[in-house]
């Protein structure tokens, strides 16, 4: 996260790491004690995954093996659409107050409306920073309308746009997959965006989740 | 394979303005900045300027401001540089070459490999 | 803005020779972004050298590039004959810059 803070602790229960060894990979957001939700571009073969702790690599943290994920059917390598993904926990999560489920949308949110973006990605761009503190940015959905005069046929139509407007804030390398959370739900998915990051009036793009809420739940369902 | 092929030679009169194409092929497009660079006959290497195909902002050398109007068009993997008011001092080669990245994705820092893809070159002649 | 020099302009030497070429930045460059290339007579440039020392894809092992900060080589352990050639420092951070040129001739 380029030009954010540090999310005030515990406010994220949502919010894993997935990590490859050691090391930050991505973000994902958990959505059922057996299910992570995040960018379909983050796909290895296995994961490490993180929950209950805004630090990374906190050894007092729930790490749990996951070895089966599930990337959306569409999901181009070349133009990034559909870039969603659920991985599949090899035991479910211990529940607490530092561990919860997000809340999945039940409909759209228009553009305006004020969201909170967080992650573990580099905080400098192009030479990489990466913080071991959970970091957040708040952001404001853009209409696909404004989005579509910086990235012309390159944004989708399941793509979200979030900024502010002459700010550098912004996500980045490493906070992939994480979640933009609007209202209390889940609104998107970090997808990509310009490089170096944090280029003012160049938005963040998401997946946007409320168009794949049927997706998702299918795919839980088929795989339990 | 990946390429960057550029328009034909050019014969201008001084004051009017040029417009050289490069169309890019065997790669992503909007992944990776688009630089232009011009080579005076005899001289060495003049960077002029650049533009991220994403979203289409620019970076100009300050000698070439007011003067330089670097574009993309995304639909058709094409960049372009136009050089208006031309003088006898801007007959050159006109090259593109290809930059660093202009979109991150993954979980990764990336490491910028160099100007590792050339156009051929295009001759601009100004002359009266 | 940074300014390359390279040194020496031009550079007379025997093929099976080893040449040395210099470039000294006005102010210090991250070694990330200092790149050389090679130009021959009506050819675009090609890249040899990236990250000062990271050969480019299909270079000979012949080409090596070190230095950090403000002074960097390019060093041609034993020229051959598609060697002679203008080679050019550049650095990258993210307005390029490019230094004057070295032509290696044949002596």
């Known amino acids: 996260i380029i030009d954010g803070y540090k999310c005030k602790e515990g406010s994220h229960p949502w919010q894993v790491a997935l990590l490859k060894g050691n090391q930050l990979h991505c973000g994902g957001v958990l959505v059922d004690k057996y299910w992570v939700l995040t960018a379909a571009h983050c796909k290895m073969g296995q994961y490490q995954v993180q929950l209950g702790s805004d630090k990374i690599g906190d050894q007092s943290a729930q790490k749990i093996k996951a070895t089966k994920s599930f990337r959306h059917p569409g999901y181009s390598t070349k133009t990034h659409v559909n870039d969603i993904m659920l991985v599949r926990l090899d035991e479910p999560v211990k529940m607490s107050s530092k561990v919860e489920a997000v809340q999945l949308p039940e409909h759209c949110e228009p553009p305006g409306t004020s969201c909170t973006v967080s992650g573990w990605g580099t905080t400098t761009s192009p030479d990489v920073t990466f913080p071991s503190d959970l970091m957040c940015s708040d952001v404001k959905l853009i209409s696909s309308r404004e989005c579509k005069k910086v990235y012309k046929d390159l944004l989708g139509k399941t793509m979200l746009c979030a900024g502010i407007p002459d700010s550098k804030t912004n996500t980045c390398n490493g906070d992939s997959g994480g979640p933009l959370v609007c209202n209390d739900t889940l609104q998107g998915l970090v997808s990509w965006g310009t490089y170096p990051c944090g280029q003012p009036n160049d938005p963040g793009v998401y997946t946007q989740v409320c168009k794949y809420k049927r997706w998702v739940m299918e795919t839980m369902k088929t795989h339990r | 394979q990946v390429q960057l092929v550029q328009s034909g030679a050019e014969v201008k009169k001084p004051g009017a303005s040029v417009k050289v194409s490069c169309k890019a092929s065997g790669y992503t497009f909007a992944g990776y900045d688009m630089h232009w660079v011009r080579q005076a006959p005899g001289q060495g290497l003049e960077w002029m300027g650049s533009i991220n195909p994403t979203s289409g902002r620019t970076n100009y050398a300050q000698k070439f401001q007011g003067r330089v109007t670097m574009t993309r068009d995304t639909s058709i993997s094409t960049a372009y540089m136009e050089l208006s008011r031309l003088r006898s001092d801007d007959t050159a080669v006109y090259y593109c070459?290809?930059?660093?990245?202009?979109?991150?994705?993954?979980?990764?820092?990336?490491?910028?490999?160099?100007?590792?893809?050339w156009g051929q070159g295009t001759t601009v002649t100004v002359s009266s | 803005e940074i300014v390359l020099t390279q040194s020496p302009g031009t550079l007379s030497l025997s093929p099976g020779e080893r040449a040395t070429l210099s470039c000294r930045a006005s102010q210090s460059v991250s070694s990330d972004y200092l790149a050389w290339y090679q130009q021959k007579p009506g050819q675009a440039p090609r890249l040899l050298i990236y990250?000062?020392?990271s050969r480019a894809t299909g270079i000979p092992d012949r080409f090596s590039g070190s230095g950090s900060g403000t002074d960097f080589t390019l060093t041609i352990s034993r020229l051959e004959p598609e060697d002679f050639a203008v080679y050019y420092c550049q650095q990258y951070a993210p307005l390029w810059t490019f230094g004057g040129g070295t032509k290696v001739e044949i002596k």
């Open positions: 990250g000062a020392s």
């Open positions: 070459a290809r930059g660093g990245p202009s979109t991150w994705y993954g979980g990764s820092a990336y490491t910028y490999y160099g100007a590792d893809v």
